[in-house]
C-alpha cells in the first residue's frame, strides 16, 4: 500500500526555549520525519511570510535584533503539496528603548485630574520606572502610570520617564509638556491716589494680579459707572463723590477672579 502524503516535519531550535537576547545567535533545524513522494523544496516562514534565500534545512540567525522576534516554521513540499512544521515563537529580549510620555489631558485646568503614561518598547516588559518633572525626580513614582487627582499650577512643565527591565535601563526621551490653566491669582484693587481722597478729586485705581494662565485679556469693575479706563487694568474716576464708597475689580482670562473691595473713604470737600 503506497499512501502519498505531504511531508511530516519537526522543528528544533537552539536555545530550546527560543528566548534570546539582542545580539545572540539562534539556530533552527527542520527535520523531515516522512514524505511520500520525496520532498523537493524547503523554505522558512516568519509570521506566515516566506524568508528570502532561506532554502536549507537549517536557519541560522546571527546577531538577532528585536525585529526578528516572531513565529517561525519551516515548509517542505513534495508533489502532493506543502507540509508545515509547528511554529516556534522566537522572543528577542532587549533593554527598554527611549521612552515617551503621554499626558491625558493637556492643557489641564487647575483642580482637574491628569494621568501620565510612560511608553517604552522593551522585552521583557519594564519592571520599574523613574519619573521626572522638569528634570527633577518625582519621589516614590515607580509605576508605568502617574495619576494626579487634582492638578496645581506649578505641576506645569516637562514630564519624562525612564523604563527599566532585567536587561538594563532605557534612556530618557524628550518628555511631554503639561500646560496648566488657571484663573488670575491674588487679584487686588489698589488706590493710586495719596490719602485722604476728597470729594471732587480724580481717583485712579489699578487692578493687580500675581499670575494667570492664559494671560489676562480684560478687567471688570464693581459698581459699574461711566468711568474712564485709560489703559488695561486702570480705572479713572473723575470728580469723585462721597457716595463712591467701595470699588472692586476682577482680572479675567477664561475665568474672572474678583479682588476684595477697597474703601475709598471720600471726605467732604
Amino acid at each position: 500500500l503506497n499512501v502519498k502524503h505531504t511531508p511530516k516535519l519537526e522543528i528544533k531550535v537552539t536555545p530550546s526555549d527560543a528566548i534570546v537576547r539582542e545580539g545572540d545567535s539562534v539556530t533552527m533545524t527542520c527535520e523531515v520525519s516522512s514524505s511520500n513522494p520525496e520532498y523537493t523544496t524547503v523554505s522558512w516562514l516568519k509570521d506566515g511570510t516566506s524568508l528570502k534565500k532561506q532554502n536549507t534545512f537549517t536557519l541560522n540567525l546571527r546577531e538577532v535584533t528585536k525585529d526578528q522576534s516572531g513565529k517561525y516554521c519551516c515548509q517542505v513540499s513534495n508533489d502532493v503539496g506543502p507540509g508545515r512544521s509547528e511554529e516556534v515563537f522566537l522572543q528577542v529580549q532587549y533593554a527598554p528603548e527611549p521612552s515617551t510620555v503621554q499626558i491625558l489631558h493637556s492643557p489641564a485646568v487647575e483642580g482637574s485630574q491628569v494621568e501620565f503614561l510612560c511608553m517604552s518598547l522593551a522585552n521583557p516588559l519594564p519592571t520599574n520606572y523613574t519619573w521626572y518633572h522638569n528634570g527633577k525626580e518625582m519621589q516614590g513614582r515607580t509605576e508605568e502610570k502617574v495619576h494626579i487627582p487634582k492638578i496645581l499650577p506649578w505641576h506645569a512643565g516637562t514630564y519624562s520617564c525612564v523604563a527599566e527591565n532585567i536587561l538594563g535601563t532605557g534612556q530618557r526621551g524628550p518628555g511631554a509638556e503639561l500646560d496648566v490653566q488657571y484663573p488670575p491669582k491674588k487679584v487686588t484693587t489698589v488706590i493710586q491716589n495719596p490719602m485722604p481722597i476728597r470729594e471732587g478729586d480724580t481717583v485712579t485705581l489699578s487692578c493687580n494680579y500675581n499670575s494667570s494662565n492664559p494671560s489676562v485679556t480684560r478687567y471688570e469693575w464693581k459698581p459699574h459707572g461711566a468711568w474712564e479706563e485709560p489703559s488695561l487694568g486702570v480705572l479713572k474716576i473723575q470728580n469723585v463723590g462721597w457716595d463712591n464708597t467701595t470699588i472692586a475689580c476682577a482680572a479675567c482670562n477664561s475665568w474672572c477672579s474678583w479682588a476684595s473691595p477697597v474703601a475709598l473713604n471720600v471726605q467732604y470737600a
Epitope: Q139, G140, K150, L152
Partner: antibody, heavy 124, light 107 residues
Framework: QVTLKESGPGILQPSQTLSLTCTFS??????????VGWIRQPSGKGLEWLTN???????NYNPSLKNRLTISKDTSINQAFLKITNVDTADTATYYC????????????????WGQGTSVTVSS | DIQMTQSPASLSASLGETVSIECLAS??????LAWYQQKSGKSPQLLIY???RLQDGVPSRFSGSGSGTRYSLKISGMQSEDEADYFC?????????FGGGTKLELK
C-alpha cells in the same frame, strides 16, 4: 501647627439629620492643594471614608452614602461641615475630619493630620 | 471600588522582633498608598505615604514597600509603644478605601 477638631450632637434619633463641624487651624482651605476629608469608625471596627472638600470647592463622595451626604466649607472661619440625612443606628460611629495636603516630593495628596474624633450615637 | 485586603488581622510580637503587615489591592494603585497607626482610644496617625515615604517625625524602624497591587509595612524591632491597630489606605481612585486593619500586640 496643624490641628483639627470635630464637634457634633453626640446623640440623635433615627431619621434625623446629623450635622458635624470640623474646626481647623494651621492651614487654609483657600490654599491650592488643600482639602478636608471626613472618615468614620464604628466602635471596634475599621475606617470608612465618607467625603472630601477641596480648596476649589470640588467635592467627592462615597457612592454608598452619596445621596445622604453634603459637605461644605467656610474658609473665612476655617471650618468644614458634614450633613448626613436620615440617620440610622448603623451610622453610630466616631467621626473624624482630616486635612488632605499635597506632598511635593512625588505629587501625592495625603490625609496627613486627623482630628481627635467625635462620638455619634443614633438611638431611639 | 478598589478593595484593600489586609493581613494578618492580628499578630503578637516580642520586643525587638521584626513585624510585617501586608495589604493587597484589588487593582493597581500606582503607589498611592498610606499606612496609619491607631492607638487605643486615639485618632489615626500617618506613618507612611506614597507606599514607601516616611512621614516626618515617624521612627525609622517603620518602613513601607511594594508596587502595583501588593504593599507591606515593616517594623524592624518592635517597641512597646508600637502596640496599636494599623490600617492601609488607597487614594488612587474614589472612593478612598481602607484595609480591615491589623491589631498588633506585645507578647
Amino acid at each position: 501647627q496643624v490641628t483639627l477638631k470635630e464637634s457634633g450632637p453626640g446623640i440623635l434619633q433615627p431619621s434625623q439629620t446629623l450635622s458635624l463641624t470640623c474646626t481647623f487651624s494651621g492651614f487654609s482651605l483657600s490654599t491650592s492643594g488643600m482639602g478636608v476629608g471626613w472618615i468614620r469608625q464604628p466602635s471596634g471596627k475599621g475606617l470608612e471614608w465618607l467625603t472630601n472638600i477641596w480648596w476649589d470647592d470640588d467635592k467627592n463622595y462615597n457612592p454608598s452614602l452619596k445621596n445622604r451626604l453634603t459637605i461644605s466649607k467656610d474658609t473665612s472661619i476655617n471650618q468644614a461641615f458634614l450633613k448626613i440625612t436620615n440617620v440610622d443606628t448603623a451610622d453610630t460611629a466616631t467621626y473624624y475630619c482630616a486635612r488632605i495636603a499635597h506632598y511635593f516630593d512625588g505629587y501625592y495628596y495625603v490625609m496627613d493630620v486627623w482630628g481627635q474624633g467625635t462620638s455619634v450615637t443614633v438611638s431611639s | 471600588d478598589i478593595q484593600m485586603t489586609q493581613s494578618p488581622a492580628s499578630l503578637s510580637a516580642s520586643l525587638g522582633e521584626t513585624v510585617s503587615i501586608e495589604c493587597l489591592a484589588s487593582g493597581g494603585i500606582s503607589n498611592d498608598l498610606a499606612w496609619y497607626q491607631q492607638k487605643s482610644g486615639k485618632s489615626p496617625q500617618l506613618l507612611i505615604y506614597a507606599a514607601s515615604r516616611l512621614q516626618d517625625g515617624v521612627p525609622s524602624r517603620f518602613s513601607g514597600s511594594g508596587s502595583g497591587t501588593r504593599y507591606s509595612l515593616k517594623i524592624s524591632g518592635m517597641q512597646s509603644e508600637d502596640e496599636a491597630d494599623y490600617f492601609c489606605q488607597q487614594s488612587y481612585k474614589y472612593p478612598y478605601t481602607f484595609g480591615g486593619g491589623t491589631k498588633l500586640e506585645l507578647k
